[in-house]
């Protein structure tokens, strides 16, 4: 008598999530009499997937009519496949009895589920960094299968190389996650720059998914400060200008100090944007030279985006050089960021 064979012809089957999977199984003999059951996994923890005789298996149907005389095809179809259905499926022949006795198992068919990765989510640093510093961006995508996946980073269309990528878990799983970190060197020109995380996977048919982050969220461009004096007016008033240039973001507070005392405080708002995304701002202060007997120390103090204040100081020299009265000549910049501006007293 020929020994019963349980034949599972496919060692593996791959199905897209949402589709149906057909798991084939035939037996070589009708004898002995007894049922076929399908299990996922082996050993004491195996799960019953289909038993024609009893149980409710709403997603599983027999491919052939199992009640038909001389039926030797016990293939099944599982509908609406999800990643959780992945595993090795065994077609098992039992001999009829009380209880039925397990006789022979097929070699097993490994079902793998192709699942699309989720849209990549890119997150940047929690706090802004200044130009010439390196910041890290992370990109995450989840729920894909099989494990093979490609992730690339781009900054303004150029691929980044300082990248570390991990796919978890390391071994076989129903689905996988990818997490990648890219280190990006910021420059003063990066306000309008963008980083893109691009994920390619077999389920995407060559149309990769992209996640983006704007460097404007991560960068701080500190301002340049320039203090100049306009021509002295006939009424002995000196017009002093503090030019604050090339800064980002717009959040900026400027304070004028006269001899250490607050003269005026201004907040930047609704500034026009430069081509590179930075901002400029100019503030004027009129100093009445005739009202002062001694030299006046003026300070332009700028607090940008919550950072420590930056000062630019200079002195208006009263009656020191009457011959230079009304001149437009700026003095040498001293080591203490001071300008000496000479004016005559009335």
């Amino acid at each position: 008598e020929e020994e019963l064979q349980v034949i599972q012809p496919e060692k593996s089957v791959s199905v897209a999530a949402g589709d149906s999977a057909t798991l084939n199984c035939t037996v070589s003999s009708l004898i002995p009499v007894g049922p076929i059951q399908w299990f996922r996994g082996a050993g004491p923890g195996r799960e019953l997937i289909y038993n024609l005789k009893e149980g409710h298996f709403p997603r599983v149907t027999a491919v052939s009519d199992p009640t038909k005389r001389n039926n030797m095809d016990f293939s099944i179809r599982i509908s609406n496949i999800t990643p959780a259905d992945a595993g090795t499926y065994y077609c098992v022949k039992f001999r009829k009895g009380s209880p039925d006795v397990e006789l022979k198992s097929g070699a097993g068919t490994e079902l793998s589920v192709r699942a699309k990765p989720s849209a990549p989510v890119v997150s940047g640093p929690a706090v802004r960094a200044t130009a010439e510093h390196t910041v890290s961006f992370t990109c995450e995508s989840h729920g894909f299968s099989p494990r093979d996946i490609t992730l690339k980073w781009f900054k303004n269309g150029n691929e980044l190389s300082d990248v570390q990528t991990n796919v978890d878990p390391a071994g076989k799983s129903v689905s996988y996650s990818i997490r990648s970190t890219a280190r990006v060197l910021l420059t003063r020109r990066d306000v309008h720059s963008q980083v893109i995380c691009e994920v390619a996977h077999v389920t995407l048919q060559g149309d990769p998914l992209r996640g983006t982050a704007n460097l404007s969220e991560a960068i701080r461009v500190p301002p340049f400060l320039e203090v100049t004096q306009q021509s002295m007016r006939a009424d002995n008033q000196v017009n002093v200008t503090c030019q604050v240039t090339k800064f980002y973001p717009q959040r900026l507070q400027l304070t004028w100090l006269e001899n250490g005392n607050v003269s005026r405080t201004e907040m930047a708002s609704a500034l026009p944007e430069n081509k590179d995304g930075t901002y400029n701002w100019t503030s004027w202060l009129l100093v009445n030279v005739s009202a002062h007997r001694d030299d006046v120390k003026l300070t332009c103090q700028v607090e940008h985006d919550g950072q420590p204040a930056v000062n630019k100081s200079f002195s208006v020299k009263v009656s020191a050089h009457p011959k230079e009265q009304g001149s437009n000549t700026a003095a040498e910049n001293t080591g203490t960021n001071e300008r000496n501006i000479y004016g005559g007293s009335g």
Partner: antibody
Amino acid sequence: QVQLQESGPGLVKPSETLSLTCTVSGGSIRDYYWSWIRQPPGKGLEWIGFIYYNGRTFYQSSLKSRVTISLDTSKNQFSLKMTSVTAADTAVYYCARVRAYSGIGLDGTDVWGQGTTVTVSS
Amino acid sequence: DIVMTQSPLSLPVTPGEPASISCRSSQSLLYSTGYTYLDWYLQRPGQSPQLLIYGGSSRASGVPDRFSGSGSGTDFTLKISRVEAEDVGVFYCGQALQTPLTFGQGTKVEIK
């Protein structure tokens, strides 16, 4: 090549909870049973229990009320928690992989960790 | 629970000579599929156990062919055709038919 590494405290006080973790490297959690086995000093092997990749657990009946085995597939780790320990729980604890190819039984405990010594003492 | 009983518990051996260890189970380990759920392990001094034989007679990967397993039902034998010095340690049989998995008491093999 699959390797297993046990980690956890070497000294536990009586009545407290013993917690051990086994990290699986170089291979997959799926399709295997993940077992804890212990060996008291100078004695033989005692199976504590195992967990299948699908989350189903099986325990030694004498320890069932005190033991929990759990699986973290994202970290490729499985863990043992044993409550209300006594001096009788002093042993070398091994984590191990058990194979299952088909049928109802198992096909050998083929990969073992190096073992971690746990002493229960105040 | 299935009880596993080994004999002898101690086995002095001479290198180059054969050796044999017996294992008996309290119920048959031959399943209806024809598979025998009996394994043999060796625990060398200071080391973890290693799988030698599974399924009653199949050698595990990397195990020398001087080790062989035989038997069916409830009586099993592990044979070493020519003992080598590295074979010293404690040999355990274990059943994998049903939970709880159980092991024999162990047979300590030492050089005479």
